[in-house]
Each structure stands twice: as structure tokens, then as C-alpha cells.
């Protein structure tokens, strides 16, 4: 009876999310393998988040709006492990917007989700950021490693969206 009611709840939650995400990929987790954590198909998952790489070339503001429509934000990178996971799926000759910007050009960088900007957990390429006119951040491959660079926000780039996993 308990399992039946849990399944019913799960199905109703799935139906609720179906209007936003036509397809979800779920895995069982938790100590009793009773919880399902899901990401929209074909998003990838890492720890408690889902990631989507958009190959559409758009400005930073349009890229953020695009993520927002999908219930996400441009990616906020919190750890080197997270960055290493993300970069496995990126093309080395491309650049991708991050959810990091400096709208006033005062070198006061801010994450789109209001996560405090911690200078000690940043992965800027050597010499970057280097221009107050370049107010948005990308991740790209340079000098044999992935890192961040400041660029013009209005210049179209690919982008990475991030959202919290859906738990049902």
C-alpha cells in the first residue's frame, strides 16, 4: 500500500513536469534507492544539477533568457570538479557563455543566481579578465587547458545552462 501511494505520487509529479519537459531521464538514488533524481532529456547530470549545452550562437543576455525559459540559468561553476565535468562535453574550438558578468565594468563580477563571487574559486586564463568593456565571461580552451575569459556581452557565443535536478 505504501509503495502504491508512492508510485501514484510519483506519476502525478511526472505529469506535472511533463508540461515543461516532454522527456525526463531519472535515476534511483538515496540510501534505500527510493528517490528518483531526474534531468530533462538530453541534459547531462552531475551531483545535484543538470546541464545543457546550447550550440545556438546568441548574445549573453539572450543566452540567459534562453536558459530561463527552460527553468535554468547560465551555468554557475562552484568547483574545479564541476568545471572538469562540464568541459568533457565541450568542443575545444568553441567558447561558451557562463552565468558570470560585470555589467558596470567595475570588475565587480556577479553570478546570475546571486552566488557570492569568490576570487579563490575562479578559473580565469592567465592575464584575464583584461578589459572593462568585456563584461561577460566565457569558458574556452587555451594554452592546453579550459579556463575563463572576459568578452563582449553582445557578441554571439554558444552557452551552458544549469538547473537543479528534479526529485520525484
Amino acid at each position: 500500500n505504501f509503495m502504491y501511494s508512492k508510485t501514484v505520487k510519483r506519476l502525478s509529479k511526472l505529469q506535472e513536469y511533463q508540461q515543461y519537459y516532454p522527456s525526463l531521464t531519472c535515476v534511483m538514488e538515496g540510501k534505500d534507492m527510493e528517490d528518483w533524481s531526474c534531468c530533462p532529456t538530453p541534459w547531462t547530470s552531475f551531483q545535484s544539477s543538470c546541464y545543457f549545452i546550447s550550440t545556438v550562437m546568441q548574445s549573453w543576455t539572450k543566452s540567459q533568457n534562453n536558459c530561463s525559459v527552460m527553468g535554468a540559468d547560465l551555468v554557475v561553476i562552484n568547483t574545479k570538479e564541476e568545471q572538469d565535468f562540464i568541459t568533457q562535453n565541450l568542443k575545444i574550438n568553441s567558447a561558451y557563455f557562463l552565468g558570470l558578468s560585470d555589467p558596470k565594468g567595475w570588475r565587480h563580477w556577479q553570478w546570475v543566481d546571486q552566488t557570492p563571487y569568490n576570487k579563490n574559486v575562479t578559473f580565469w586564463h592567465s592575464g584575464e579578465p583584461n578589459s572593462p568593456d568585456e563584461r561577460c565571461a566565457i569558458i574556452n580552451f587555451r594554452s592546453e587547458e579550459w579556463g575563463w575569459n572576459d568578452v563582449h556581452c553582445h557578441v554571439p557565443q554558444k552557452s551552458i545552462c544549469k538547473m537543479k535536478k528534479i526529485y520525484i
Partner: antibody, heavy 121, light 111 residues
């Protein structure tokens, strides 16, 4: 006082080339992005090319891509537009304009007086 | 590309009256309260001159009779009261995304 002075315009035959120059003074040229904007006779404004302050980024509309090249010499406080394979529809007054960044975009806060390019056989 | 449509194409206004020009963008040029639409004035035989930046900010040295408003896709330039020296073409321009684009212009004549 900010000044932008264009030169190099003239009459050229279709298929020909011209190099426009813009001499900047009264500000730290190397700190600003610059653009060329043109205006055909009796028509509106059309952006033609942009170059970033550090020369790392150039951008063109499809109408001139592959034919026009924007460049700058920060040591000489000068902006250039190399125009090749010119067409009749490139006939216009060409303005150089300074970009001032605001939030996620920019506007053109100073313009030169313009130089006239006429493409005709 | 973002297309900017200005209206009217021309208007004639008596001195002391109000002139209103609108600019409609094919998609939003605003983001989190910042509106990346700008206005320029161009008098015959002269280069364009910046009037208003970011929808409503008056450029230094521009008379206070010029004002701008709007957000998203719809923006307005108002001249109130109009003076004889305001005879000119007026252009809007967006910069939220490359390529930067201009409206087709509005010709303002003083009756």
C-alpha cells in the same frame, strides 16, 4: 575635446579598392572600441564594421564581410577601413564612431564628419 | 538581426508643441531593467549626434526638452516643446546584440 577626422574617400570604379582613415584625438584611443557606420545618399544609417579596443575582436555585417577589413593602430591613434571589390551599393558617406560601453551593450557617443565614397564607372 | 521600425516616417510640428517618435524592436532589447536602446539626431549635412542612451538617459549637453522612455520592444523619443532648431532626422539604435542596428529614421519638420 574629442575629435574624429575621416579621410580617404573619393570616386572609384566598381571592383576597385579604397582605404579610409580616421584620426582620433582628445581621448585615450586605445581604451575604446571603434566602428564605421555608413549612410547612402538620402538613406538611413547602416553599421559597417566594429573593432574592439585591444584589436582582439572585429565584426562585420554580411553585406561587407570578406570585402571590408577594419583595423587600428593605437600608437598612431588611427582607425582604418580597407574596402575591396567595391560595388555601386557601397556609395555612401562613411563615418567613424567611438563606442562607449553601457551595461551589456554600447552606444556611439562621438562621430566624425564623414568621408564620401562614390563607386561608379 | 534585430529589426527596428520607427514611426512615423515624418512629422510636421508647430513650435511649442510636442513631437513623439516611436521605435519598435522585433525582439526585446531590455535585460533586468537595462534598456539598450539609444537615440540620435542628424541635421542636414552633419554627422549623427547622440541624444539619449539606454532608453532614458540624456546625453551631456542635450537640452532637457528631449526625453526618452520605454522598455522591452517599445520605445519613445519625445521633444517637448519643439523648437525650430530641432528640424532633423532622428534614429533609434539597439546594442543588446550584434549586429548593432538602426531604425529607418524619422524626419521632423517645424511648421
Amino acid at each position: 575635446e574629442v575629435q574624429l577626422v575621416e579621410s580617404g574617400g573619393g570616386l572609384v570604379k566598381p571592383g576597385g579598392s579604397l582605404r579610409l582613415s580616421c584620426a582620433a584625438s582628445g581621448f585615450t584611443f586605445s581604451s575604446y572600441g571603434m566602428s564605421w557606420v555608413r549612410q547612402a545618399p538620402g538613406k538611413g544609417l547602416e553599421w559597417v564594421a566594429t573593432i574592439s579596443s585591444g584589436d582582439s575582436y572585429t565584426y562585420y555585417p554580411d553585406s561587407v564581410k570578406g570585402r571590408f577589413t577594419i583595423s587600428r593602430d593605437n600608437a598612431k591613434n588611427s582607425l582604418y577601413l580597407q574596402m575591396n571589390s567595391l560595388r555601386a551599393e557601397d556609395t555612401a558617406v562613411y563615418y567613424c564612431a567611438r563606442q562607449l560601453y553601457y551595461s551589456y551593450g554600447y552606444y556611439f557617443d562621438y562621430w566624425g564628419q564623414g568621408t564620401t565614397v562614390t563607386v561608379s564607372s | 538581426d534585430i529589426v527596428l521600425t520607427q514611426s512615423p516616417a515624418s512629422l510636421a510640428v508647430s513650435p511649442g508643441q510636442r513631437a513623439t517618435i516611436t521605435c519598435r524592436a522585433s525582439e526585446s532589447v531590455s535585460f533586468h531593467g537595462t534598456h539598450l536602446m539609444h537615440w540620435y539626431q542628424q541635421k542636414p549635412g552633419q554627422p549623427p549626434k547622440l541624444l539619449i542612451y539606454a532608453a532614458s538617459n540624456l546625453e551631456s549637453g542635450v537640452p532637457a526638452r528631449f526625453s526618452g522612455s520605454g522598455s522591452g520592444t517599445d520605445f519613445t523619443l519625445t521633444i517637448n516643446p519643439v523648437e525650430a532648431e530641432d528640424t532633423a532626422n532622428y534614429y533609434c539604435q539597439q546594442s543588446i546584440e550584434d549586429p548593432p542596428t538602426f531604425g529607418g529614421g524619422t524626419k521632423v519638420e517645424i511648421k
